[in-house]
Every structure is written in C-alpha cells, then in structure tokens.
C-alpha cells in the first residue's frame, strides 16, 4: 500500500477525500485536514506540509488550499443570528432570527424576512425546520381557537366550562373561546321564556 507522494498514471488517487492529484509531478499527495492549510507543497520526495489555521480563520474540509478562509460573523442586517461560533474547522453557523424565514439561499441562507401573520382562526403549519420558509396558515382544528393576527400564535383548545364548575353561555368558534357563566346567574331575557316552558 503506497503512501503519498506516489506516482499516478491515470490522474486519480486512491483516497479522493484525503489525497489529490498534483499534475506537475504526476503524483498523488496528501490533502491537509480540516483546520489546516498547505504551508509547503508536495514534491516527488516530500509529502504536503500542513499548518494550523491562524485565529479567526478556518478550512472546513480536507484541502490543498494555501490559505485559510476568514471567519465572518452572521449579518444581523440580513436578519441572521449566530448559533455557533467559527472555529478552525468550521465557518460561523447562522440561522434566521426568531419570527423570520429564509428568503434567499445560496449554499446557505443569505437573507431572512419577517414571517407573515396568520389571521384569527388559523395558525402556522409546523415545519420540520424553523426558518426554512414563510408561514403557511391552516385553520384551527375543531374545538380550538386563535384570536390574534400573529406569525407564531398557536390555536388553543376551547375552555371546557364544566371543568371549572361553570356552564356554557356561548359556544367557542375558530376565532373565539367558549364563554362560560356561573350556573346560578339568570339567563339573558331573550332565553327566559324557553326556560319557563
């Protein structure tokens, strides 16, 4: 089993992830591991020499780069916030700020926008990944209500009056909760006739 550097006639290397083809000498050389860069290129008699990325710079993959990438902060103006810092082995990890979704994507999210409000009687459909898309509002399911215009409000179950020792005065709708009243309270005048019968 040859170790780098070794000759390669077909311009391919055994380990594509950790080796690369160097055309000048027609050899396979070692790539540098994440967090490092090439400080001296390989030759026929000497393999690649790697050095650690300086503070504030990184290389994420096995590479044959002669420099490390500069760490960049997430851009708050674009609605992004940081979830993890840059290290020598990874770039800064960003996500959309709460209440926002990714509106522009180029390998990663570059721009976030405010989530649309869901009107009363609806709620935002839960997504697998927060911040991936704008709200899709769905009606509250039976027995639930939501009474605001909000990007994040959830439908709540209607109050069960009997659980509180009360009786229902008005049924709940998709946009309003059940109205309860004390069982001893008199009924409104328009309903009192029915009661007398």
């Amino acid at each position: 089993q040859a170790v780098p550097p070794y000759a390669s006639e077909n311009q391919t290397c055994r380990d594509q992830e950790k080796e690369y083809y160097e055309p000048q000498h027609r050899i396979c050389c070692s790539r540098c591991p994440p967090g490092t860069y090439v400080s001296a290129k390989c030759s026929r008699i000497r393999d690649t020499v790697c050095a650690t990325c300086a503070e504030n710079s990184y290389n994420e993959h096995w590479n044959y780069l002669t420099i490390c990438q500069l760490c960049r902060p997430c851009d708050p103006v674009m609605g992004l916030e940081e979830i993890a810092p840059c290290t020598s082995k990874r770039k800064t990890q960003c996500r959309c700020q709460p209440g926002m979704f990714c509106a522009a994507w180029a390998l990663e999210c570059t721009h976030c926008e405010l989530l649309s409000d869901c009107p009363p009687g609806t709620e935002a459909e839960l997504k697998d990944e927060v911040g991936k898309g704008n709200n899709h509002c769905v009606p509250c399911k039976a027995g639930h209500f939501q009474n605001t215009s909000s990007p994040s409000a959830r439908c709540q179950p209607h109050t069960r009056c009997e659980n509180q020792g009360l009786v229902e005065a008005a049924p709940g709708t998709a946009q309003s909760d059940t109205t309860c009243k004390n069982p001893l309270e008199p009924l409104p005048p328009e309903m009192s006739g029915t009661m007398l019968m």
Partner: antibody, heavy 116, light 107 residues
Framework: QVQLVQSGAEVKKPGQSVKVSCKAS????????LHWVRQAPGQGLEWMGW????????QYNEKFKGRVTITADKSTSTAYMELSSLRSEDTAVYYC?????????WGQGTTVTVSS | DIQMTQSPSSLSASVGDRVTITCKAS??????VAWYQQKPGKAPKLLIS???YRYSGVPSRFSGSGSGTDFTLTISSLQPEDFATYFC?????????FGQGTKVEIK
C-alpha cells in the same frame, strides 16, 4: 501583546444598574468577538453574551436577555457590559474575554457587589 | 442548553500524582471543548482547546482527550503550582456553558 483591562470594583443597591468597561489593546479590536463571563463567589463560570465590534452586533444568553446590554466603542477599543435591575444574586466577578476556540485572553475581572 | 457535568467536584492529590478530571456533555459537541485552570482571585487560564490541543506555553504534563460527549483532562505528574480549580467549557453552540469545576487540593 493582547491585553484586556477592566474598570474597577462597583458596589450597587438592588434595582440599580452597573456598567463595566473592558479596554482592549494589542490587536485589531473590530475583528474579534468579545464575551462577558461572570463568576459568583465560590461558584462556576457563566457566559453572558458577546459583541462583535466590527458591526457592533451583540448576542446574549437567554437567561440575561432584557437585563444585559453589551456595547462597544470602536474609537477607544472599549467594550461595555451593562446589567440592570440588579439583585443580590448578581454579586459576582465579571470578566471580559476574547474568544477563539475557547477564551485565550481574559480581563482581570471586575467585582460587582449588590447589597442593600 | 448543553450541560457540562464535571467530576469529581474536588480531589486531594500529592506532588507527582497522575490526576484525571472528566467532563460529560449532555449532547454531542464534537471536539469543541476547552479546559481552564483558575487560581483564587485570578482570571481562568486556557490550557486546552479543541479537546486535545495544548495552548501555547502550557506545560506538556497537561493533556486533553475525547470527542462527542466525553472529555478528559489529565495532569501526568502534579506539580506544586498545579493546585487550583479546573473548568471544562463547550464552545460548540450558544450559549457557551462550563462545568461546575474541580478543585485540586494538596493531600
């Protein structure tokens, strides 16, 4: 060499605010994150938040959100941490620290005592 | 938040002893763990970053290992100046969190 020099000790009453400064030297102030970490007497370390002086954007530990404000003055290479609505549990040593795969550089610490 | 559970909370040892301190993360933090030494009235000092990389100027008797959730700081031969409190810290995701500390005392 990198140096972080903090302001002197403070004694405050409950409900008041305190503002601690951290003057940086020996590096480009705008290209590194500055964090604030506190340590209550005989206790562990607690991360409060950071500021990136390049865009003066700060991010906070949820635990302190609404009570802590971290700012920076690029012209004087100084970061500030203001903590409001102080209570006795806020009695601690407050450190600023520059980050890179941990905190290689720390200020000397500022003791804040909250007592009525 | 990621919890960093450090053990033991204190230990007594003699000069020349081999000392091992462990830290367990509540979720995978890769190798994004640092170790610090702190002496009374002083700021913490970075000993190890990226779980196993000794910070410049740190004596070779200090070593770190581990990845994922389990991490270890080892002092191969304890010296008089090593009696202090040691903390682990994860910097994998915000909020950064620290272990509660291990106080190394003279036996």
């Amino acid at each position: 060499q990198v140096q972080l020099v903090q302001s002197g000790a403070e004694v405050k009453k409950p409900g008041q605010s305190v503002k601690v400064s951290c003057k940086a030297s020996g590096y480009t102030f705008t290209t590194y994150y500055l964090h604030w970490v506190r340590q209550a007497p005989g206790q562990g370390l607690e991360w409060m938040g950071w500021i990136y002086p390049g865009n003066v954007h700060a991010q906070y530990n949820e635990k302190f959100k609404g009570r802590v404000t971290i700012t920076a003055d690029k012209s004087t290479s100084t970061a500030y941490m203001e903590l409001s609505s102080l209570r006795s549990e806020d009695t601690a040593v407050y450190y600023c620290a520059r980050s890179w795969e941990g905190f290689p550089y720390w200020g000397q610490g500022t003791t804040v005592t909250v007592s009525s | 938040d990621i919890q960093m559970t450090q053990s033991p909370s204190s230990l007594s040892a003699s000069v020349g002893d081999r000392v091992t301190i462990t830290c367990k993360a509540s979720q995978n933090v890769g190798i994004n763990v640092a170790w610090y030494q702190q002496k009374p009235g002083k700021a913490p000092k970075l000993l190890i970053s990226s779980a196993s990389y000794r910070y410049s100027g740190v004596p070779s008797r200090f070593s770190g290992s581990g990845s994922g959730t389990d991490f270890t700081l080892t002092i191969s031969s304890l010296q008089p100046e090593d009696f202090a409190t040691y903390f682990c810290q994860q910097y994998d995701t915000y909020p950064f969190t620290f272990g509660q500390g291990t106080k190394v005392e003279i036996k």
